[in-house]
């Protein structure tokens, strides 16, 4: 025998108190699948949370975080405080990045500036708390008399010595 409740669609529940009739989910509740014997209470996006998507009879509400915070975890289970660019969140709140580090986002940690010399390059633009350094050509390319952009050497045919 087929379970009569299996005929109840999403947005309804199988009401045992009414001979297993499919009843609509009450206000502020939902059922996302058919054949449910109860409806789930809608999530309420209050306090640090705000509503991104309203609850319907077939789907739960979705929350995000109020301005000044960003979501953490699946379904925005928690909110973390934003900081400004050039800062990171510490135990004592938002603090400026230390010299030699930067953060170009409102979240995350300060990261060290790129060390241009490791790639044999020079610093073209200095780093700030908000921005990484910009590496330029290698120091040898910037020696006196050398143009800042070295043109490619002309191709030589084999067996010809340079002039």
């Amino acid at each position: 025998l087929q379970d009569p409740c299996s005929n109840c669609p999403a947005g309804t529940f199988c009401d045992n108190n009414r001979n297993q009739i499919c009843s609509p989910c009450p206000p502020n509740s939902f059922s996302s699948a058919g054949g449910q014997r109860t409806c789930d209470i809608c999530r309420q996006c209050k306090g640090v949370f705000r509503t991104r998507k309203e609850c319907s009879s077939t789907s739960n509400a979705e929350c995000d975080c109020t301005p000044g915070f960003h979501c953490l975890g699946a379904g925005c289970s928690m909110c973390e405080q934003d900081c400004k660019q050039g800062q990171e969140l510490t135990k004592k709140g938002c603090k400026d990045c230390c010299f030699g580090t930067f953060n170009d986002q409102k979240r995350g940690i300060c990261r060290p500036w790129t060390n241009c010399s490791l790639d044999g390059k020079s610093v073209l633009v200095n780093g700030t708390k908000e921005r990484d350094v910009v590496c330029g050509p290698s120091p040898a390319d910037l020696s006196p008399g050398a143009s800042s952009v070295t043109p490619p050497a002309p191709a030589r045919e084999p067996g010809h010595s340079p002039q």
Epitope: R43, Q44, K46, G47, V48, F49, F69, L72, G73, S77, M78, C79, E80, Q81, L89, T90, K91, K92, G93
Partner: nanobody, 128 residues
Framework: EVQLVESGGGLVQPGGSLRLSCAAS????????MGWVRQAPGKGREFVSA????????YYADSVKGRFTISRDNSKNTLYLQMNSLRAEDTAVYYC?????????????????????WGQGTQVTVSS
């Protein structure tokens, strides 16, 4: 056994100050996000403030922003709520709550279902 014990409530005149404390035991305090929730007579619960396990993230309801300050001392397993410029509408029972999850060291929640443990509450009455 987990315990949250609030103290510091009492009767204060409008404009006055109080400092609530919540002493925690029976769990790893620094891993838990904490919150202060109040309930006035005949009204629903209101999340007043919350703080992450590390203390870095704090949240305040608009109704208390600029007047209340939440803090925690993880070495003493204690949560605090400094309440200044108190108003008659701050009269309520204040509860502390503790909840943990993957992000509870850095994040906060104002969803009551997130919180695993609740204290018994302390009464704050603001009246002249």
């Amino acid at each position: 056994e987990v315990q949250l014990v609030e103290s510091g409530g009492g009767l204060v005149q409008p404009g006055g100050s109080l400092r609530l404390s919540c002493a925690a035991s029976g769990f790893t305090f620094s891993s838990y996000a904490m919150g202060w929730v109040r309930q006035a007579p005949g009204k629903g619960r209101e999340f007043v403030s919350a703080i992450s396990g590390s203390g870095g993230t704090t949240y305040y309801a608009d109704s208390v922003k600029g007047r209340f300050t939440i803090s925690r001392d993880n070495s003493k397993n204690t949560l605090y709520l400094q309440m200044n410029s108190l108003r008659a509408e701050d009269t309520a029972v204040y509860y502390c709550a503790a909840g943990t999850g993957y992000y509870s060291r850095v994040g906060v929640s104002t969803d009551p279902s997130f919180y695993d443990y609740w204290g018994q509450g302390t009464q704050v009455t603001v009246s002249s």
